[in-house]
């Protein structure tokens, strides 16, 4: 009854505001779009997030909401504005009939509308607890700095903040935005309501079983007693964090999102905004044994997305499902039988499994790294997490075949020392989404805002591709790969590096007339070659018999097929030096690799020649991998010959700066 009265009251106000002439003329031109969760059971029709254009002010948001209510009322529909967003994203949350969507999409300032959907805790079995004492010696792990300068926000269930493991470490905020529990006979048992959040708080900062024992935490309740929440509730939680950050700026902030729902444009956008405000977000990849790119916030590029492995460094199986995987995962971390605080009693411990637990590990590691180096940016932190991870220890056979190459084979680890990594040139590999199979399809891979794109390569499982090129987009270089006719699609692979004070440009040579192949070099003074790309318009690049190896004494040169245009990435940065390393195999082979030596970082990876039997090239950690078609399907031996070309760089400037600090 109260609810109905509330609706009526708002409706009257809405009508009055319409009469007061607050309505504006609708904008023409751009059409707002509607989005909803691809997973039907997770949809929450009747509640919608109306996202307004970026520059929209709060007053305009409120006016647009009132206008929607007024127009809906004229059509005989009741609506209720549940929340007006500002601080992170402009917009509002509205309860209304789906019949009004067409109307709402035509309102001024509207960018897009997303139907609300569910998000879920990512632990199993988070309410079937098995109480166990900590099964380790506590003095085996006592880090020098426990993350004491960092505040970790946890968006989860309610938590038992006075549990012995976490007492005094967790401040329970007054934020709560959760849906009603399902089922009429649901019995709210306090210890079960607190289970998931208490365990994760313990994994992050617990006295005895925590990763960052010195980190202080703040908890927001966005998941109910069944571990279920909503995208809208999570959005409002993220907005709460942003407002808290503005009101009382503290040291570095880490936000742990141990939850997942279907792909959500709005949730990813909110995460992007918060990340760009200097907040480190860490999330669970999801427990659906599926591509993490199909889930949010796991699919948000600005978020550090964590998959789960077990004590043997194998991907975690969870019942019939297991950890998510794919290019949207940044790294893996322990996520099976993780011991942490149990809400069953104030001294109890329990083991839980899932990508939530894995994400909590990484949030703890991040807190420790940020406590040691509070000025680290998100890009620097992500690169360090990748750099210090255990490499190539995961058995990739567990992943679907088409996801193996895309999934990072990295298990998070604490740096041997929290200081002293500053001299390193850090790079990571970023895969694009699949282009799709159409003739002109392209795929784009992008680096983070404060990373430099140092090289660009492409890969196609069918081998039908038209190479790749680096191009400017919005003032930043991106890596674009091109599909070919009859191809099943391509991936673009960007090599993204941290290179302070870098000035990079792309030099292009069009296809050569002569038969010797195309060449391009870095001709500007002080610029060094960091990567080579080639792109061709012809459908099938023929064999390239003449030698294509780089002439001696010309390290700053890219060479390629005469029918291809060649692109050289040339960079100037203090103390940057690079060298080209090649590994050619005369006999046909499905994979050719070349690695950079200790102290050097792989910045570029390409194949010679760029003929059609080469599937592509990509960097895996410090190794350049060139893949060719199955040798049994390849024709002549000469066509089978492939050379992997690595460009290895280091920065003397970073090394000197590091020595001066020590």
């Amino acid at each position: 009854q109260e609810d109905e009265d509330g609706d009526y009251e708002e409706l009257v106000l809405a009508l009055r505001s319409e009469e007061d002439g607050l309505a504006e003329a609708p904008e023409h031109g751009t059409t707002a779009t509607f989005h909803r969760c691809a997973k039907d059971p997770w949809r929450l029709p009747g509640t919608y997030v109306v996202v307004l254009k970026e520059e929209t002010h709060l007053s305009q948001s409120e006016r647009t909401a009132r206008r929607l209510q007024a127009q809906a009322a004229r059509r005989g529909y009741l609506t209720k504005i549940l929340h007006v967003f500002h601080g992170l994203l402009p917009g509002f949350l509205v309860k209304m009939s789906g019949d009004l969507l067409e109307l709402a999409l035509k309102l001024p300032h509207v960018d897009y509308i997303e139907e609300d959907s569910s998000v879920f805790a990512q632990s199993i079995p988070w309410n079937l607890e098995r109480i166990t004492p900590p099964r380790y010696r506590a003095d085996e792990y006592q880090p020098p700095d426990g993350g004491s300068l960092v505040e970790v926000y946890l968006l989860d269930t309610s938590i038992q903040s006075d549990h012995r493991e976490i007492e005094g470490r967790v401040m329970v905020t007054d934020f709560e935005n959760v849906p009603e529990e399902d089922g009429t006979r649901f019995h709210r048992q306090a210890s079960k309501c607190d289970s998931h959040g208490t365990h994760l708080a313990g994994v992050v900062s617990g006295r005895d079983a925590g990763v960052a024992k010195g980190a202080s935490m703040r908890s927001l309740r966005v998941l109910n007693c069944q571990g279920k929440g909503t995208v809208s509730g999570t959005l409002i939680g993220l907005e709460f964090i942003r407002k808290s950050q503005l009101v009382q700026p503290v040291g570095p902030l880490v936000v742990l999102l141990p939850l997942a729902g279907g792909y959500s444009r709005v949730l990813n956008a909110a995460c992007q905004r918060l990340a760009r405000a200097g907040v480190v977000l860490v999330t669970a990849a999801g427990n659906f044994r599926d591509d993490a790119c199909l889930y949010s916030p796991a699919s948000a590029p600005e978020v550090i997305t964590v998959g789960a492995t077990n004590a043997q460094d194998q991907p975690v199986t969870l019942g019939t499902l297991g950890t998510n995987f794919g290019r949207c995962v940044d790294l893996f971390a322990p996520g099976e039988d993780i011991i942490g605080a149990s809400s069953d009693c104030s001294t109890c411990f329990v083991s839980q499994s899932g990508t939530s637990q894995a994400a909590a590990h990484v949030a703890g590691i991040a807190a420790m790294m940020l406590s040691a180096e509070p000025e680290l940016t998100l890009a620097e932190l992500r690169q360090r997490l990748i750099h210090f991870s255990a490499k190539d220890v995961i058995n990739e056979a567990w992943f679907p075949e088409d996801q193996r190459v895309l999934t990072p084979n990295l298990v998070a680890a604490l740096p041997p020392s929290t200081h002293g990594a500053g001299w390193q040139l850090f790079c990571r590999t970023v895969w694009s989404a699949h282009s799709g199979p159409t003739r002109m399809a392209t795929a784009v891979a992008r680096c983070a805002p404060d990373e430099e794109l140092l090289s660009c390569s492409s890969f196609s499982r069918s081998g039908k591709r038209r190479g790749e090129r680096m191009e400017a987009q919005g003032g930043k270089l991106v890596c674009r790969a091109h599909n070919a006719f009859g191809g099943e699609g391509v991936y673009a692979i960007a090599r993204c590096c941290l290179l302070p004070q870098a000035n990079c440009s792309v030099h292009t040579a069009p296809p050569a007339e002569a038969s010797m192949g195309t060449r391009v070099h870095c001709h500007q003074q002080g610029h060094v070659l960091t990567g080579c790309s080639s792109h061709w318009e012809v459908e099938d690049l023929g064999t390239h018999k003449p030698p294509v190896l780089r002439p001696r004494g010309q390290p700053n040169q890219c060479v390629g097929h005469r029918e291809a245009s060649i692109h050289a990435s040339c960079c100037h940065a203090p103390g940057l030096e690079c060298k080209v390393k090649e590994h050619g195999i005369p006999a046909p082979q499905e994979q050719v690799t070349v690695a950079c030596e200790e102290g050097w970082t792989l910045t570029g990876c390409s194949a010679l020649p760029g003929t059609s039997h080469v599937l592509g090239a990509y960097a895996v950690d410090n190794t350049c991998v060139v893949r060719s078609r199955d040798v049994s399907t390849t024709g002549s031996t000469s066509e089978g010959a492939v050379t992997a070309v690595a460009i290895c760089c280091r920065s003397r400037h970073l090394a000197q700066a590091s020595q001066e600090l020590q």
């Epitope: 010696r137 006592q142 038992q160 903040s161 006075d162 005094g168 005895d208 104030s346």
Partner: antibody, heavy 115, light 109 residues
Amino acid sequence: QVQLVQSGAEVKKPGASVKVSCKASGYTLTSYGISWVRQAPGQGLEWMGWISFYNGNTNYAQKVQGRVTMTTDTSTSTVYMELRSLRSDDTAVYYCARGYGMDVWGQGTTVTVSS
Amino acid sequence: QSALTQPASVSGSPGQSITISCTGTSSDVGGYNSVSWYQQHPGKPPKLMIYEVSNRPSGVSIRFSGSKSGNTASLTISGLQAEDEADYFCSSYTSTSMVFGGGTKLTVL
């Protein structure tokens, strides 16, 4: 500032009960429980148990289990410790302290059990 | 009988350093990071001096330090001062409760 203020001294006969109070202030109560510790004259410290301000859950030491009851009154931010069937060896100073970490202590309440 | 064993007394001259040991088992001191040390002057409540093995609360002099090896924790007081004369108690978590040491009387000569 963080403070725990306890009730005054008590003299009880053997077999009786005593109820000591401890009023907490200056911090977020739900972030810590309250421990009770006693100290017999000239002796060491003995942990008696713990109670949660958050949900009222308790954890009693085996030695006093069955004779002790700890309760909270969240409206007044007060914790109570009741000890029944008093014996002469229950004569001690009873302290409340913040949480399991016991980083802040009350001033103590002397309980004398004498016939 | 206290669960944790401490020497009944130790003494030292002003300016000297002393160490008080606290021995338990793998079920208490050895199994947890949560060893605390308390100072108690006569007629006063205990005061926390060290928590979680080696951390000092704000306001506690840097002359007080804690460490742990295996099942034994230690409190070291350097540059002894007259006001350090007091009883010192260690405590540790056990799986379900808390235990204290019997206490050590520190005399500053």
